[in-house]
């Protein structure tokens, strides 16, 4: 590849570098669907943005293949815990790929926050943070799931969120 | 913009890329002021550094606009709690901008760590981590606040810290 | 340095940029040695990879000096807590350098997860996440330690992991 080609590549790289893919999506009232699907996110208002990534039904969609640091935080809380609720909350980032029919676990955390509330009227708060580097191909998607999502507390987009950037 | 201009830009970009803004500030004895202000940080000693960002009264100050991954961890701990199990800790990253008189919440976490003290021992430890991508303009500042800061434990700069890097 | 030299440097930089150092290592059955050493990690299978970093006996080994965002998550859990176990778990990232005989603490977290299990037969889960930017020289190593590692739960590489990327 001659000087001209290299030059074009560098120009291209500079431009693409200017838009190194990144996104930060925030929790909203509509995030919790109760349908068993992934959490949904705000993509434009307030602190939320998409740059070189797209969004579809709760998923960050990769447009440029590479290694991404993906992260999510969820704010948990309640007054006591729902009767019969298993004492474990699972918060995870999962990959959807056209090459495989099921979601693939990427980063997962399990917590037992309800042990902190020993009576049914006790208010408690807890938080779960996940972050790590994964390889994503163009077209692959990443979603956030929380089981049991009844314990996720949403307010203003600062306490529960989901993001990624290419490294 | 002709070849020469592009060349200069690329050279410039290479140089600026060498100093991609980043910082890691560490907790110190002077971090907790008790004044209601943000936490203060060590900027030079040990693991602390500033590269392409500056510091002022607890705040990381942005010199180059862009998207930044900002993060903070605080080590929480105590012997009992001032409000018992009802004690809530709020740990947050907040933005100060010349364009708005009040601090803006960026990333926030609430925890009820005091339930971690067992009946046989009043001693407990907990940790809160926040991280996420936000857009910051030149001159804007980011600070860390913890309410109730009496529950923050400082020791050697490895347990409570605050940092950022451009993505 | 003339145009040709600059050109070569830019070409070089583009290539090195393509391999910006990054790694994500995952927990495996062999991670917990019980020997008092650091945790060991999977480097190739599943989600694990090394790019511009190497691995040796639990350690990420730096080949290119610079500032790195390093991170680790460990999944904690148990049924009650081991008799006589101090209620504190320490999870940390530590640096090994040829210039100093002892490991240096980089990022550390202490938690008291066992307070969440109110009876000796109660199942509990907790998670600890650490992440921050540190400067690492070529040849320096970073390891993860957890005390008491009996409380680390491994399953499939998604719950306990260790990674880094250059910023």
């Amino acid at each position: 590849d001659g000087p001209a080609g290299s030059w074009e590549q560098l120009i291209q790289e500079r431009r693409s570098h200017e838009v190194n893919p990144a996104a930060h999506l925030t929790g909203a009232n509509s995030s919790l669907t109760g349908s068993g699907g992934p959490l949904l996110w705000e993509t434009q208002l307030g602190l939320a943005f998409l740059r070189g990534l797209s969004y579809h039904d709760g998923a960050l969609v990769v447009t440029k293949a590479g290694y991404y640091y993906i992260y999510s935080k969820v704010q948990l809380g309640g007054v006591g815990c729902p009767l019969g609720l298993a004492s474990t909350i699972t918060h995870g980032l999962y990959k959807r790929t056209p090459r495989y029919p099921e979601e693939l676990e990427l980063l997962v955390s399990q917590q037992s926050p309800c042990g902190r509330a020993t009576s049914s009227s006790r208010v408690w708060w807890d938080s779960s943070f996940l972050g790590g580097v994964v390889h994503l191909e163009a077209g692959e998607e990443v979603v956030v799931r929380v089981l049991d999502e009844r314990l996720v507390r949403l307010r203003d987009g600062t306490r529960s969120y989901f993001g990624a950037f290419m490294v | 913009d002709g070849p020469a201009g592009s060349w200069e830009q690329l050279i410039q970009e290479r140089r600026s890329h060498e100093v991609n803004p980043a910082a890691h500030l560490t907790g110190a004895n002077s971090s907790l002021t008790g004044s209601g202000g943000p936490l203060l940080w060590e900027t030079q000693l040990g693991l602390a550094f500033l590269r392409g960002l500056s510091y002022h009264d607890g705040a990381l100050v942005v010199t180059k606009a862009g998207y930044y991954y900002i993060y903070s961890k605080v080590q929480l701990g105590g012997v009992g709690c001032p409000l018992g199990l009802a004690s809530t800790i709020t740990h947050g990253l907040y933005k100060r901008t010349p364009r708005y008189p009040e601090e803006l919440e960026l990333l926030v976490s609430q925890q009820s760590p005091c339930g971690r003290a067992t009946s046989s021992s009043r001693v407990w430890w907990d940790s809160s981590f926040l991280g996420g991508v936000v857009h910051l303009e030149a001159g804007e500042e980011v600070v860390v606040r913890v309410l109730d800061e009496r529950l923050v434990r400082l020791r050697d700069g490895t347990r409570s810290y605050f940092g950022a890097f451009m993505v | 340095d003339g145009p040709a030299g600059s050109w070569e440097q830019l070409i070089q930089e583009r290539r090195s940029h393509e391999v910006n150092p990054a790694a994500h290592l995952t927990g495996a059955n062999s991670s917990l040695t019980g020997s008092g050493g650091p945790l060991l990690w999977e480097t190739q299978l599943g989600l694990a990879f090394l790019r511009g970093l190497s691995y040796h006996d639990g350690a990420l080994v730096v080949t290119k000096a610079g500032y790195y965002y390093i991170y680790s998550k460990v999944q904690l859990g148990g049924v009650g807590c081991p008799l006589g176990l101090a209620s504190t778990i320490t999870h940390g990232l530590y640096k090994r350098t040829p210039r100093y005989p002892e490991e240096l603490e980089l990022l550390v977290s202490q938690q008291s997860p066992c307070g969440r299990a109110t009876s000796s037969s109660r199942v509990w889960w907790d998670s600890s996440f650490l992440g921050g930017v540190v400067h690492l020289e070529a040849g320096e190593e970073v390891v993860v330690r957890v005390l008491d590692e009996r409380l680390v739960r491994l399953r499939d590489g998604t719950r306990s992991y260790f990674g880094a990327f250059m910023v």
């Epitope: - | 012997v79 001032p82 409000l83 021992s121 | -």
Partner: antibody
């Protein structure tokens, strides 16, 4: 200024119960723990337990578990200590002591309430 | 329970002289570099008064002739120059673990 004012002296028969009040003023009542401590004649100080006015949560010294009950009335900024199944060795001065800002010491005390248990 | 043992049981010191009271805990009362040890003064007919918290911190309004030191299991209360109004019983108290426990008290008198 901070004040803790306790109810007056009581004389009770063995097996009876006594309820001592401690009314707080001069500070934000719910922000501080309230402890109960007693001093029997010729004895040292003995911690009975604490109550968190914000929630009503209580912690008791095992020695008094089942006999002591701490309650709070936030509307009047008053905490109460009730001790049941009284015996002669419960004869003592009972104090309420406010938890300090750093909550693991008692920085203000009530004047004390003498409870005499006698048949 | 953590047992707190004070020595001596009583102490007679001349006005203006130093008075030293020791307190030994049956186990460490330290946590993360802080000692959960307090000292109180009690005069006849009065409630206890906080003098020192966290082993060495002087409570607001307490004269600076009072000082505290120590860590782990061994602690000391010092009155650098005894005054007549210092005649009282002094108690140490641990707050690292429930139940909070006090020493048996040290009676300080004028010689």
């Amino acid at each position: 200024q901070v004040q803790l004012v306790q109810s007056g002296a009581e004389v009770k028969k063995p097996g009876a119960s006594v309820k001592v009040s401690c009314k707080a003023s001069g500070y934000t009542f719910i922000d501080h723990i309230m402890n109960w401590v007693r001093k029997a004649p010729g004895q040292g100080l003995e911690w009975m337990g604490r109550i968190y006015p914000v929630s009503g949560e209580t912690n008791y010294n095992q020695k008094f578990m089942g006999r002591a009950t701490f309650t709070v009335d936030r509307s009047t900024s008053t905490v109460y200590m009730e001790l049941s199944s009284l015996r002669s060795e419960d004869t003592a001065v009972y104090y309420c002591g406010r938890g300090s800002y750093y909550w693991n010491a008692m920085d203000y005390w009530g004047q004390g309430t003498l409870v005499t248990v006698s048949s | 329970d953590i047992v707190m043992t004070q020595s001596p049981d009583s102490l007679a010191v001349s006005l203006g002289e130093r008075a030293t009271i020791n307190c030994k805990a049956s186990q460490s009362v330290d946590f993360d570099g802080d000692s959960y040890m307090n000292w109180y003064q009690q005069k006849p007919g009065q409630p206890p008064k906080l003098l020192i918290y966290s082993a060495s911190n002087l409570e607001s309004g307490v004269p600076d002739r009072f000082s505290g030191s120590g860590s782990g299991t061994d602690f000391t209360l010092t009155i650098s120059s005894l005054q007549a109004e210092d005649v009282a019983v002094y108690y140490c108290q641990q707050s690292i673990e429930d139940p909070w426990t006090f020493g048996q008290g040290t009676k300080v008198e004028i010689k």
